[in-house]
């Protein structure tokens, strides 16, 4: 529960770094990694695909996954905009956040609960995670009802974003 | 896609900084800028106004805009609390995040979908963005149905917040 | 509104640190504190309890509270997953974020608004805060309708998370 050596409590004599400032600097949490990707225009499966021409820095994109290149504690956030043509029953919209293909967190919202066939119902769903990730860890997003993700009228609203909060070097 | 020189891969001989530790230090991502503003009590237009007596550090507030003073990658998040006296039809609540007056991201939710005139319906809507912003970039928020933003019973719930994740010096 | 001395504008001659690089380093915002806790399985009161075996670094957990150990500007975010068996009237779900037992921010959403007794309605609610916190400050979460928090089918979805953005040493 304690904070590892930072310059406030760095050993000045002896120990790992002593007074070697370059050594101290090399240990400092300077690393920055981040990504901000928008959903692909045409979705055809529950695992979402993303536009790889988004912001990517210190992270790779491959086959619908963000792939971690630097280990550490990451803040991950995904937000999706749904547009549902209500059927006669209610609809459960689900957003799953997966780490290495394991569901780590999900969010659910029920829409069209009145059972009335209204023209359109909008719903926005987000999900976040703060987790330690190793090199080559994959991050992906799954949505049961991908046909309701609004990629045409609101193409910029569906995003997956991460940033490295604290590197674990 | 790689991370620019950080102390882990700083050139020790020659190059820009060599072993000049002060030079290295001056390059380190120490800059911090942030803001956390609550919505103004009296709203009269779709572009929201904010209480300028909130938290402002390394960011200016002017005429409903947050104005960037240090370039870099910013995390931006806005959250609004709506209170709708349902009419006989459904209501679409929208939150638009604008950068330099261009819509960068929006969130929509439909309420009162049953078509019943209920007393009150609460809805909470949030929106985030991770984006590179230059000096003098403006950040603003637009809401079609500003009359539904609950500034009286829930005055602290409607906020616009940003923080600099990585400076681009 | 200006940023306090950082290495970009550190005084090189005279002043607090002069060219004492260790002094400069000791002032740098290296401190990192964070937490990511999932809700306890069995809830029996409106003040939520959390699993203390989550991620805790530079923060303590005690009696339903996160307790700050290092002063600074913190980003706080809570997300809850509700599952409501609709009664004949609408239900207001509320999430309160408390700092030192004072409500700092709350989010409300109305579900079951159609007045129909549907089988289940899912709703997801989140709340964030960016605030300066002193040592021993407590952070807690209150929910009127804790019986609707879905700890059985979705035990991982209900989380309270914080991270230190900027330390105030």
């Amino acid at each position: 529960d304690s904070i590892p050596n930072s310059p406030d409590n760095v050993p000045l004599k002896g120990g790992d770094c002593s007074e070697d400032l370059l050594c101290i600097l090399k240990r400092a949490p300077f690393k920055k990694s981040w990504a901000y990707l928008q959903v692909a225009k045409h979705l055809d499966k529950t695992k979402l695909s993303w536009n790889k021409d988004g912001i990517l820095h210190g992270v790779r994109y491959q086959d619908g996954n963000l792939v971690i290149q630097f280990p550490g504690l990451y803040f991950i956030i995904c937000q999706l905009q749904f547009l549902v043509q209500c059927p006669q029953n209610s609809v459960d919209l689900k957003l799953e956040l997966l780490i290495n293909k394991h569901i780590k967190k999900q969010a659910l919202v029920t829409v069209c609960e009145s059972g009335m066939q209204t023209k359109h119902v909008y719903q926005n769903l987000s999900q976040f995670l703060l987790d330690y990730l190793q090199v080559d860890t994959t991050i992906s997003v799954n949505v049961d009802t991908f046909q309701y993700i609004d990629t045409s009228t609101f193409p910029l609203e569906n995003v997956l974003s991460i940033f490295l909060y604290s590197n674990s070097d | 896609d790689s991370i620019p020189n950080s102390p882990d891969n700083v050139p020790l001989k020659g190059g820009d900084c060599s072993e000049d530790l002060l030079c290295i230090l001056k390059r380190a991502p120490f800059k911090k800028s942030w803001a956390y503003l609550q919505v103004a009590k009296h709203l009269d237009k779709t572009k929201l106004s904010w209480n300028k007596d909130g938290i402002l550090h390394g960011v200016r507030y002017q005429d409903g805009n947050l104005v960037i003073q240090f370039p870099g990658l910013y995390f931006i998040i806005c959250q609004l609390q709506f209170l709708v006296q349902c009419p006989q039809n459904s209501v679409d609540l929208k939150l638009e995040l604008l950068i330099n007056k261009h819509i960068k991201k929006q969130a929509l939710v439909t309420v009162c979908e049953s078509g019943m005139q209920t007393k009150h319906v609460y809805q909470n809507l949030s929106q985030f963005l991770l984006d590179y912003l230059q000096v003098d970039t403006t950040i603003s928020v637009n809401v079609d149905t500003f009359q539904y933003i609950d500034t009286s019973t829930f005055p602290l719930e409607n906020v616009l917040s940003i923080f600099l994740y990585s400076n681009s010096d | 509104d200006s940023i306090p001395n950082s290495p970009d504008n550190v005084p090189l001659k005279g002043g607090d640190c002069s060219e004492d690089l260790l002094c400069i380093l000791k002032r740098a915002p290296f401190k990192k504190s964070w937490a990511y806790l999932q809700v306890a399985k069995h809830l029996d009161k409106t003040k939520l309890s959390w699993n203390k075996d989550g991620i805790l670094h530079g923060v303590r957990y005690q009696d339903g509270n996160l307790v700050i150990q290092f002063p600074g500007l913190y980003f706080i975010i809570c997300q809850l997953q509700f599952l409501v068996q609709c009664p004949q009237n609408s239900v207001d779900l509320k999430l309160e974020l408390l700092i030192n037992k004072h409500i700092k921010k709350q989010a409300l959403v109305t579900v079951c608004e159609s007045g129909m007794q549907t089988k289940h309605v899912y709703q997801n609610l989140s709340q964030f805060l960016l605030d300066y916190l002193q040592v021993d400050t407590t952070i807690s979460v209150n929910v009127d309708t804790f019986q609707y928090i879905d700890t059985s089918t979705f035990p991982l979805e209900n989380v309270l998370s914080i991270f230190l953005y900027s330390n105030s040493d």
Partner: antibody, heavy 124, light 110 residues
Framework: QVQLQESGPRLVKPSETLSLTCTVS????????WSWIRQPAGKGLEWIGR???????NYKPSLKSRVTMSVDTSKNQFSLRLNSVTAADTAVYYC??????????????????WGQGTSVTVSS | QSALTQPASVSGSPGQSITISCTGS?????????VSWYQQYPGKAPELMIY???NRPSGVSDRFSGSTSGNTASLTISGLQANDEADYYC??????????FGGGTKLTVL
């Protein structure tokens, strides 16, 4: 300064509806919560509920099914309706302003201005 | 939603200090620092003496002070005076955006 005055019938028959009005003078009814509290003879205070100037309400759970509160901003008044009354509803009824000042945080500061109270008896 | 629990009566001599306790639950005093205290003379409306645990409205004597610990709040009156003889009620903001009162304590100045 703000003053409150309760008004309404002093006698109500069982199973009927108790209706009271509180008139606010010396200040505006807007941007405040307004509460109703009652006190049976020789007993303690019981909070019934509150109404915001926008019409938003919160009621004591055990009374929720029988209570309705509303606001008339044009008359600077707020009112209480209690349905299906019984002898147990006999009490002195007070209206009060909730001291709810908001700056950078909420203040739920209790009731700082009270009416003098009106005695209501439920009897046939 | 049960009432807060107060002792039915307390007494003290002039000049002494007395403390009135008010026990609630984790849904009110245990969660919120929104505890207030009222003084009520016979046949009169209550008057706010303390708000937010330990704050006094202007005009209230500094002999009145409040505190909380866990699910219990306390009102202390120091330098007891004859005109302190009255009924005292605690109140706390509670979950579901409601208020709850205590049963009241009769203070007798001997």
């Amino acid at each position: 300064q703000v003053q409150l005055q309760e008004s309404g019938p002093r006698l109500v028959k069982p199973s009927e509806t108790l209706s009271l009005t509180c008139t606010v003078s010396g200040g505006s009814i807007t941007n405040n919560y307004w509460s109703w509290i009652r006190q049976p003879a020789g007993k303690g205070l019981e909070w019934i509920g509150r109404v915001y100037s926008s019409g938003l309400t919160n009621y004591k759970p055990s009374l929720k099914s029988r209570v309705t509160m509303s606001v008339d901003t044009s008359k600077n008044q707020f009112s209480l309706r209690l349905n299906s009354v019984t002898a147990a509803d006999t009490a002195v009824y007070y209206c009060a302003r909730e001291r709810a000042t908001v700056t950078t945080r909420y203040h739920y500061d209790g009731m700082d201005v009270w009416g003098q109270g009106t005695s209501v008896t439920v009897s046939s | 939603q049960s009432a807060l629990t107060q002792p039915a009566s307390v007494s003290g001599s002039p000049g002494q200090s007395i403390t009135i306790s008010c026990t609630g639950s984790s849904s009110d005093i245990g969660t919120y620092n929104y505890v207030s205290w009222y003084q009520q003379y016979p046949g009169k409306a209550p008057e706010l003496m303390i708000y937010e645990v330990n704050n006094r409205p202007s005009g209230v004597s500094d002999r009145f002070s409040g505190s909380t610990s866990g699910n219990t709040a306390s009102l202390t009156i120091s330098g007891l005076q004859a005109n302190d003889e009255a009924d005292y009620y605690c109140s706390s903001y509670s979950s579901s955006s409601t208020w709850v009162f205590g049963g009241g304590t009769k203070l007798t100045v001997l």
